[in-house]
Interface confidence: low
């Protein structure tokens, strides 16, 4: 029988009446165009909805937008378009919501062609009030908030000027011209690239990288011959053109660009690219594209300096620059990432790592599933997950994989079971242990979301027909109840719940269509009465993460420590609550060689855990540049994996070698940098 329909499934008592009392419909007085929704702040209940409608006329497009506000998680909305003087808001800029709980919102208005500059509407009270401000420039990008101070904004103009505001958009100052890309760093620092000879495109590979730490009073050039730059964790990366040819290499800085080291990564040619897949304060996952239009490359993982890289995964699927990759950080369990590889026969397979890229394996076949037609052996196959690439290929996949940090261990994804990803209609699978084991959760494609830190999972069938039924589960997807939320089916467009998965409210968005008109409608369902009591001690059970062999003393050790979590029992129907804090008890593991990566100039032979010197480098100068200066690099061949907390046990001591090196690329060295003040 299908999941959720077998005899053991207990019903949630009186749920229809409980949900009916907590279902709130709102019909928007709009012609159907596009709708965008933003949450303002954390746990505030404030939602902004912007509806826009375009009427293409013969010579121009007439546009109309409306702004609505809810302060009860979407149960009721108020039309607040008059607060923005009934102005048409540009949807391509979206709603710029301030960081944390600043309550700040910036909307960018459409202005007539001849105007001197753009116009924004600003709110700093969670969209209760807006102030209209005319800009001295036309914005090219959405306003970007400084992560440290939400009063500081930056924007690029259509003329490539870099504009900064220090008073939340009230006054603007152009701090630099000819800017291609600008980003906030830490401590209100701004990094940006500039061109000298005409345009960003023309100067690609000859750009300069600048930094200002005082919002444009003074500047420092921290790099030349720049192709692009990026920030990840505590690392600043720049791809830099080589002196002699058209190749470029990654350089990395951990001190905001004062000093640079050449990353020990392959150089790339004109048609190739680098991409930071994930980064934190410990390490970086870097994708390096293969030469030629292969659609794949190699994932490398860095050491704690961002300099030394270990090959992590070959044939990693990544279509083109800015294209599609399935790389997914499973946020519900430390160290877990899922991605796709392109195999030799051009089929796509899913791989998973549980140790931050150290080893990759196929996903275990779900116990309640059969191998599909892609499987050569009907008894041996694995689960393959649909993510961004499948969605881009217009497969019947409405959603990417979902995990939430506070719903420990839970991963939900569309997938197929075989030797590779199938183009057949997928089903929905769930893992409750961070990806080690999987179960088919729902038949066919669905939209899904997690509420109350995993206490409730909600799903809606993906269908071209109008729908009026929502499914929910209180036991991590084992059993499902269905609830008819309206008599009149709607054309479903999306599920919305507050980011962070702490809420117990879900909004179902769609439109109704009648003979002459169609209107936006939302139904917000509050599940608080389904989970009618607060969870108590008896509702939780202790769970050891990454446990694969309970007999093993080191069971659960990943990156040098194991973690026990307190998790809600599947049988408990109760509220974790909005103040639920995921709590875990770590214990340190003994070190083994697996807790170390091989340092520069060393490698691990296959099926061996010891690091040995690379034969081709014996007696040679290494093409390696540390902080751009001539100095000896000393190593014992091993370096602890970033974030690894092991203690005691194996301590791999080797004879210390002097690795002489030459700096083949010294244009990011300190003496080549200069400063200037405004």
């Amino acid at each position: 029988s299908a999941p959720g329909e077998d005899e053991e499934c207990g019903r949630v008592r009186d749920f229809v009446a409980k949900l009916a009392n907590n279902t709130h419909q709102h019909v928007f007085d709009d012609l159907r165009g596009s709708v965008s929704l933003s949450w303002v702040g954390d746990s505030t209940g404030v939602i902004l909805v912007l509806t826009t409608f375009h009427v293409p006329l013969v010579i121009m497009t007439f546009g109309q937008s409306k702004l609505y506000r809810s302060e009860d998680y979407g149960k009721n909305f108020k039309d607040i378009t008059d607060l923005i003087n009934n102005t048409f808001i540009r949807t391509e800029f979206g709603m710029a919501i301030g960081p944390e709980n600043s309550g700040k919102v910036v909307l960018t208005a459409e202005v007539s062609g001849g105007s001197r500059g753009g116009r924004i509407f600003r709110s700093s009270d969670f969209a209760k009030n807006f102030v209209q401000t005319d800009l001295p420039f036309h914005p090219l990008t959405q306003m970007m908030y400084s992560p440290q101070n939400s009063d500081y904004l930056l924007a690029l103009s259509t003329e490539n000027g870099l504009w900064v505001s220090k008073n939340f958009g009230g006054k603007w100052e152009e701090i630099h011209k000819a800017v291609c890309l600008a980003k906030w760093g830490s401590d209100n620092t701004i990094f940006f690239t500039t061109y000298a000879n005409g345009s960003c495109k023309a100067d690609l590979g000859a750009l300069e990288l600048w930094r200002t730490s005082d919002l444009g009073k003074s500047f420092k050039t921290i790099g030349v011959k720049i192709y692009s730059f990026g920030l990840g964790g505590r690392f600043l990366f720049a791809s830099v053109m080589a002196d002699k040819d058209t190749t470029r290499r990654i350089h990395v800085s951990t001190d905001q660009g004062d000093t640079w080291s050449m990353a020990q990564l392959p150089s790339v040619g004109q048609e190739q690219f680098y991409s930071i897949l994930a980064a934190n304060d410990d390490m970086v996952f870097m994708h390096v594209d293969e030469p030629g239009d292969t659609g794949f490359g190699t994932i490398f993982t860095s050491d704690d300096r961002g300099i030394v890289y270990s090959k992590s995964l070959d044939r990693h699927l990544y279509t083109t620059t800015g294209g599609e990759t399935d790389f997914t950080n499973v946020t519900s369990l430390r160290g877990v990432y899922i991605t796709s590889v392109l195999s030799e026969d051009n089929s796509i397979q899913t791989m998973i790592t549980f140790d931050q890229g150290g080893r990759w394996t196929h996903l275990r076949k779900p116990e309640n599933s059969e191998c599909d037609a892609t499987a050569k052996n009907k008894n041996e196959c694995s689960l393959h997950i649909h993510a961004s690439y499948s969605i881009s290929q217009k497969l019947n996949v409405p959603m990417a994989p979902l995990s939430e940090p506070n719903a420990v261990g839970i991963v939900i994804a569309h997938g197929s079971v075989g030797d590779a990803i199938s183009v057949m209609v997928p089903d929905v699978y769930i893992s409750d242990d961070g990806g080690y084991s999987w179960t088919k959760m729902l038949e066919g494609p669905h939209y899904y979301t997690i509420l109350d830190s995993g206490g409730i999972i909600v799903a809606i069938e993906h269908s071209s027909r109008p729908i009026n039924v929502i499914k929910f589960s209180t036991d991590e997807g084992q059993c499902w109840q269905t609830y008819t939320f309206t008599r009149d089916p709607i054309y479903f467009t999306g599920l919305a719940s507050e980011p962070g998965a702490r809420s117990m409210n879900i909004s179902i968005w769609g439109f109704t269509e009648s003979f002459l008109t169609s209107q936006w409608v939302s139904y917000t369902i509050d599940f608080k009465d389904i989970l009618e009591r607060n969870c108590e001690e008896k509702d939780y059970t202790i769970w050891l993460a990454h446990s694969t062999d309970p007999e093993d003393y080191e069971d659960g050790c990943i990156l040098g420590y194991k973690e026990q979590f307190l998790r809600l029992r599947k049988s408990s129907v109760c509220q974790n609550g909005r103040d639920y804090v995921v709590t875990k008890q770590p214990s340190i593991c003994l070190c083994s060689l697996e807790d170390f990566l091989c340092d520069f100039g060393y490698y691990r032979p296959e099926n061996d855990s010891k690091c040995v010197e690379q034969p081709e480098l014996k007696g040679h100068d290494l093409e390696f540049c540390l902080y751009g200066r001539e100095e000896h690099l000393t190593t014992n061949g091993y370096r602890k994996i970033p974030g690894d907390k092991c203690q005691g046990g194996v301590n791999p001591v080797r004879e210390v070698k002097d690795l002489k090196k030459k700096c083949t690329s010294n244009f990011l060295s300190p003496e080549k940098q200069n400063s200037k003040s405004n």
């Epitope: 746990s43 709980n101 001690e537 307190l566 909005r578 804090v581 709590t583």
Partner: antibody
Framework: QVQLVQSGAEVKKPGASVKVSCKAS????????MHWVRQAPGQGLEWMGW????????NYAQKFQGRVTMTRDTSISTAYMELSRLRSDDTAVYYC???????????????WGQGTLVTVSS | EIVMTQSPATLSVSPGERATLSCRAS??????LAWYQQKPGQAPRLLIY???TRATGIPARFSGSGSGTEFTLTISSLQSEDFAVYYC?????????FGGGTKVEIK
């Protein structure tokens, strides 16, 4: 019902140590963190740290690092807080307070002991 | 650590009147905030947790609101037994920190 019963008042000289006990009943002692909070006369509340009665693991506020030791005896469901190198400004009422279920460290305190007055005076 | 600031330090109210106490956090604590009542010679008593959820056995006249950095405890109609000192406490991050307290006294 949940009860936390603390040891009696103490008078100590500066430089000495004091050990306050907190006996728990009415619930599974090893299932919940035990926190210690103090309150100087006429002042507010100050968190000192917690002990996990299950593992014996502790977490102390920075201010008390090196001076405080929290222990437990699971056989008699009792938690202890020892403060050494006492100074006159350590004069306060010391409370034990039950936190959330095991592993949920950051918590509010639903159950409190009656308090133990420790007076430090020469 | 997160600093919790309560205001006013003292609030003089007549029985039957409404009392509004404020608590501000130096950075966002989401809704991880608790309120306690303490009477002379007694241990604190939990009133509200999660910014707005009443603890078991707490009368409905006590209500909490707010999230992020600004919080309010409201006592809708003061009874004689409500005159006490009230503390807020954040439990978003370790160490848990308390406000300095608001003394509610009879006017």
């Amino acid at each position: 019902q949940v009860q936390l019963v603390q040891s009696g008042a103490e008078v100590k000289k500066p430089g000495a140590s004091v050990k306050v006990s907190c006996k728990a009943s009415g619930y599974t002692f090893t299932g919940y963190y035990m926190h210690w909070v103090r309150q100087a006369p006429g002042q507010g509340l100050e968190w000192m740290g917690w002990i996990n009665p299950n593992s014996g693991g502790t977490n102390y506020a920075q201010k008390f690092q090196g001076r405080v030791t929290m222990t437990r005896d699971t056989s008699i469901s009792t938690a202890y807080m020892e403060l050494s190198r006492l100074r006159s400004d350590d004069t306060a009422v010391y409370y034990c307070a039950r936190g959330g279920p095991q592993l949920r460290v950051a918590e509010y305190f639903q159950h409190w002991g009656q308090g133990t007055l420790v007076t430090v005076s020469s | 650590e997160i600093v919790m600031t309560q205001s006013p330090a003292t609030l003089s109210v007549s029985p039957g009147e409404r009392a509004t106490l404020s608590c501000r956090a130096s950075q966002s604590v989401s809704s991880n905030l608790a309120w306690y009542q303490q009477k002379p010679g007694q241990a604190p008593r939990l009133l509200i947790y999660g910014a707005s959820t009443r603890a078991t056995g707490i009368p409905a006249r006590f209500s909490g609101s707010g999230s992020g950095t600004e919080f309010t405890l409201t006592i809708s109609s003061l009874q004689s037994e409500d005159f006490a000192v009230y503390y807020c406490q954040q439990f978003r991050v370790l160490p848990p920190t308390f406000g300095g307290g608001t003394k509610v006294e009879i006017k």
